[in-house]
């Protein structure tokens, strides 16, 4: 698995560089998320034909993946700095579980799948210390998550692999999403 | 063409236990999970658990949890089905059954293998 | 679980009409576009033989007559025209998940 930002060997051997301000650190974080995202994705789509499924395919799921909308801010058009900051931790909270799901999904990339969960958790953390209304964000509930994950892990094989592909597919978007709205901050 | 090919009929003493192979081909092995099917004489079937032939993994109907243990072996493309302690009850035949994938694969079943449990 | 419910549990039919054979299950046994039910049928001393896969695809073999439809929780199975090979015990099943789950079975005789 890649170093995880701020691990990076240049970062020893350049003691005297300016430390990373919150803003850059948010965005290195993303980005290397972004980068375990793509090997992941690249596992699944040599594993089968998932990759060339159809959107409208991938429309009919009951899976209930986090998605930028109008109304969260985060758009150009209609931009709110705090609505924005408290979608993207909600959302980031609500994907935990379905990154818990990938964990066993992976065959050659077991320590990426791993590594996108943890840099998660870390990247939520930054964001948490960033956001000023940490009330307005709601938790997920961990008892409808477990029940969540066991529905999930009880598919059928074909089913896994569609949700993985899901999942993946719906995580990337939401983190570039993030990731032009948190540029803007 | 797929074919799962079962094991003969058992006639086992009650205590003992009993081994029952499925032999896969026509397709990798290793790339569909394989299921196991209980059928008491004149009545419907029941799921017992599946094994992932690739990893080992397996899942278990609650109910068969300690009574029944599922193996495989990828050099002879072959699934396992252990039952333990037998009683009466489990007097049945047992099917494999392997999972589709999508509408892309039907799931394909064994002929069965009939297990009498008698003293 | 999910929970296959089939009617009626046991049918007449002369030779060359219609036998509709109903499963609902419990909760939706679809997925990305796909319904997760098979329809099975079963001669005495037989296994099970798969005669409908993903609620509408017929299975090897399968004659033309054994039709498949339905989604979410609803599925039939439609035999047609009833032909003397068709008295046997009929299974509706779902594959979506583990448990896999069966209907009761209905006994399909020629009236």
């Known amino acids: 698995a890649p170093v995880p930002p701020g691990e990076d060997s240049k970062d020893v051997a350049a003691p005297h560089r300016q430390p990373l301000t919150s803003s850059e650190r948010i965005d290195k974080q993303i980005r290397y998320i972004l980068d375990g995202i793509s090997a992941l994705r690249k596992e699944t789509c040599n594993k089968s034909n998932m990759c060339e499924s159809s959107k409208e395919a991938l429309a009919e799921n009951n899976l209930n993946l986090p998605k930028m909308a109008e109304k969260d801010g985060c758009f150009q058009s209609g931009f709110n700095e705090e609505t924005c900051l408290v979608k993207i931790i909600t959302g980031l909270l609500e994907f935990e579980v379905y990154l818990e799901y990938l964990q066993n999904r992976f065959e050659s990339s077991e320590e990426q799948a791993r590594a996108v969960q943890m840099s998660t958790k870390v990247l939520i953390q930054f964001l948490q210390k960033k956001a000023k209304n940490l009330d307005a964000i709601t938790t997920p509930d961990p008892t409808t998550n477990a029940s969540l994950l066991t529905k999930l892990q009880a598919q059928n094989q074909w089913l896994q692999d569609m949700t993985t592909h899901l999942i993946l597919r719906s995580f990337k978007e939401f983190l570039q999403s993030s990731l032009r709205a948190l540029r803007q901050m | 063409e797929v074919q799962l090919q079962q094991s003969g009929p058992e006639l086992v003493k009650p205590g003992a236990s009993v081994k029952m192979s499925c032999k896969a081909s026509?397709?990798?092995?290793?790339?569909?999970?394989m299921h196991w099917v209980k059928q008491k004489p004149g009545q419907g079937l029941e799921w017992i658990g599946y094994?992932?032939?690739?990893?080992?993994?397996?899942k278990y109907n609650e109910k068969f949890k300690g009574k029944a243990t599922l193996t495989s072996d990828k050099s002879s493309s072959t699934a396992y089905m252990e039952l333990s302690s037998l009683t009466s009850e489990d007097s049945a035949v047992y099917y494999c059954?392997?999972?589709?994938?999508?509408?892309?694969?039907?799931?394909?079943w064994g002929q069965g293998t009939s297990v009498t449990v008698s003293s | 679980d999910i929970v296959l419910t089939q009617s009626p549990a046991s049918l007449a039919v002369s030779l060359g009409q219609r036998a509709t054979i109903s499963c609902r299950a419990s909760?939706?046994?679809?997925?990305?576009?796909?319904?997760?039910m098979n329809w099975f049928q079963q001669k005495p001393g037989q296994p099970p033989k798969l005669l409908i896969y993903v609620a509408s695809n017929q299975g090897s073999g399968v004659p033309a007559r054994f039709r498949g439809r339905g989604r979410g929780t609803d599925f039939s199975l439609n035999i047609h025209p009833m032909e003397e090979d068709d008295s046997a015990m009929y299974f509706c099943q779902q594959s979506k998940e583990v448990p896999w789950t069966f209907g009761g079975g209905t006994k399909l005789e020629i009236k």
């Open positions: 094994i992932n032939p690739y990893n080992d993994g397996t």
């Open positions: 059954a392997r999972e589709g994938y999508g509408n892309l694969e039907r799931d394909c």
């Open positions: 909760e939706s046994v679809d997925g990305f576009g796909i319904s997760f």
């Open positions: 026509g397709y990798t092995f290793t790339s569909y999970v």
